[in-house]
Interface confidence: low
């Protein structure tokens, strides 16, 4: 049975086996086509989601689709039902929390009262002044909190207590990539992890431990990527994995927060990377223990310089490392998070690509998660 499962796939009606390598090859080998059903699927970027959260205290903003202008949500008459609608628009299914926060001196958007229409937030037509003088601070999911805060700089062994959202993504029980838990159903990783194996069956997710082999595997229901853009082959290196059964959160299994839409990190901002990747470039072996390292944002202009990536780093990517090299992600770390800590931990990047590992002028290049928030929300909404 184990050998059969490893090398063959069972078609139904009529029952017969086909070689597993014929799964997800674009050809219908089973009469009913089930060999092409459970494959990595692409999902277009889709329309703009009409709600978003700002880094200014996670305040809610709503889009007026008629004008294309964004407005800040006034706390007047804001209800739990409206909070749930806002979060559902972003694809969250969990119970949100919200509170009033004072309108700050730097408030640059008009503040309007919010109502609901067809399960979408709208601006109240006859909206007067925001009498409460407060905005809506909204949290769709409790995220980004760990039991332990990393304190050191440089590279060292990590504890799952510090990074409870880190998962190992495995094919045929072999670690291939890292990933991050975003909510009970969803794991964020890199699309390039699935280039070689596009069938969903043999992919598993392992969560809740900092040691590679020591935790139970979770079945994957779906793997979703963005349509491949041949003009920018390194772009869109992002994937979402939907788990077959929702995770039960604990001290060692928790979600990380998505970044805010306006999370612009300046050069030298401290960030963290984690992974079980290769510990020596061009060889070595996968680390059995989760490793963590502190890095910093590296200016895209510097990263695109003639002695570096010569323009290959697009606006949907970001560079991170340390200026003289030596601390970087490497093979096997792909898909893992590049993290920023404010009040909570946010996954601002996904380990994507780079030339070598730890070179001084060629730092790690990461998928910029804030550039794909719309896509993530649209995927989640479609799967609600």
């Amino acid at each position: 049975k184990v050998i059969l499962d490893k090398y063959y796939f069972l078609c139904g009606q009529p029952l017969h086996f086909i070689p597993r390598k014929q799964l997800c090859d674009g050809e219908l080998d089973c009469p009913l086509g089930e060999d092409e059903e459970h494959c990595v699927k692409s999902f277009p970027e889709g329309p703009a989601v009409a709600v978003r959260l700002s880094k200014d205290r996670s305040t809610l903003q709503v889009l007026d689709s008629a004008t294309g202008n964004w407005f800040s949500a006034c706390f007047d008459n804001f209800t739990e039902a409206l909070a749930e609608t806002a979060c559902r628009q972003m694809g969250y299914s969990s119970k949100p929390t919200f509170r009033a926060v004072e309108i700050g001196p730097d408030q640059d958007l008009d503040v309007v009262e919010i109502t609901e229409n067809s399960q979408e937030l709208r601006m109240r037509n006859s909206s007067g002044p925001c009498l409460s003088g407060s905005l809506v601070s909204l949290h769709c999911l409790a995220c980004g909190k760990s039991l332990k805060t990393p304190r050191v700089v440089g590279v060292e062994e990590a504890s799952v207590d510090s990074w409870p959202w880190q998962v190992s993504i495995q094919y045929d029980k072999q670690h291939v990539c890292g990933g991050s838990i975003l909510d009970p159903h969803w794991v964020l990783t890199a699309a390039h992890c699935f280039r070689k194996h596009t069938d969903v069956f043999n992919w598993k997710v392992r969560a809740g431990s900092d040691k590679l082999g020591s935790f139970p595997s979770l079945a994957v229901a779906k793997i979703i990527i963005i349509e491949f853009n041949p003009m920018y082959p390194k772009d869109n290196d992002i994937a979402l994995m939907k788990l077959q059964f929702p995770l039960t959160f604990s001290g060692t299994v928790r979600p990380i927060c998505l970044p805010f839409f306006d999370e612009e990190l300046t050069p030298a901002t401290p960030l963290w990377i984690i992974g079980w990747g290769f510990t020596k470039q061009n060889g070595g072996k996968m680390s059995d223990i989760l490793l963590q390292a502190s890095v910093q944002v590296i200016d895209s202009t510097r990263c695109n310089a003639d002695d570096a990536y010569q323009g290959e780093v697009t606006e949907k990517m970001m560079c991170a490392g340390i200026p003289e090299g030596g601390v970087d992600t490497c093979q096997g770390d792909s898909g893992g998070p590049l993290m920023y800590q404010s009040d909570q931990w946010h996954v601002v990047g996904i380990v994507s690509w780079g030339y070598g590992c730890g070179g001084p002028s060629t730092p790690g290049v990461y998928t910029k998660v804030s550039a794909y928030l719309n896509w993530i929300y649209n995927v989640w909404k479609a799967e609600l």
Epitope: R151, V152, V153, G154, E156, T266, P267, A268, P270, L271, S294, V295, Q296, D299, R302, I322, P323, E324, G326, V327, P360
Partner: antibody, heavy 121, light 107 residues
């Protein structure tokens, strides 16, 4: 060879100003965090200030009086010192951060030869 | 701020002696400690970083150890050129702070 050369030190009266410069060579200056460290005569080492990208950091003893800056096109680090006091008398060293970790931490290597600032009436 | 306490403040030793200098941090700094050597009229020189990593070009008779709050610099066999003042420095957070120094003199 990596080299750092400080200049601009001298005798100044209390309340006066001075601008120190540190010329760097032998490395990509703009990619590195840079520091000023001082040493009063016969005393130990005291960190003064650091600069990285757009971030600047200062010791409490100089905050509001000293300003660190850099000109990457000229490979030069500066320390503008205003409202000088007698206790600012020291040899001022410019040093590079070897950047073995994130900003907010690090050691100093190499160091310049130092420039003496004397604040006295 | 993290305080760094070095001891002894001075010591007398002979060529060939094994010399140990200790440094204590007021809070846990993991392994983020550096050691410097300074000779009169000269700039300091980095000897050890990350508590125990020897800076390139530094003789192997120098070694560092420790983690957390307690650290040690050891010179296994003191040479004439090692008579100098030694400083420890915490490298984990601003403000970066140094120990008061240990002057190693000829006995």
């Amino acid at each position: 060879e990596v080299q750092l050369l400080e200049s601009g030190g001298g005798l100044v009266q209390p309340g006066g100003s001075l601008r120190l410069s540190c010329a760097a060579s032998g490395f990509t200056f703009g990619a590195y965090v840079m520091h000023w460290v001082r040493q009063a005569p016969g005393k130990g080492l005291e960190w003064v200030s650091s600069i990285s990208g757009g971030s600047t950091y200062y010791a409490d003893s100089v905050k509001g009086r000293f300003t660190i800056s850099r000109d990457n096109s000229k490979n030069t680090l500066y320390l503008q010192m205003n409202s000088l006091r007698a206790e600012d008398t020291a040899v001022y060293y410019c040093a590079r951060h070897p950047v073995r970790g994130v900003i907010g931490a690090g050691w100093f290597d190499p160091w310049g030869q130092g420039t003496l600032v004397t604040v006295s009436s | 701020d993290i305080q760094m306490t070095q001891s002894p403040s001075s010591l007398s030793a002979s060529v060939g002696d094994r010399v140990t200098i200790t440094c204590r941090a007021s809070q846990n700094i993991s392994r983020w400690l550096a050691w410097y050597q300074q000779k009169p009229g000269k700039a300091p020189k980095l000897l050890i970083y990350a508590a125990s990593s020897l800076q390139s070009g530094v003789p192997s008779r120098f070694s560092g150890s420790g983690s957390g709050t307690d650290f040690t610099l050891t010179i296994s066999s003191l040479q004439p050129e090692d008579f100098a003042t030694y400083y420890c420095q915490q490298a984990i957070s601003f403000p970066l702070t140094f120990g008061g120094g240990t002057k190693v003199e000829i006995k």
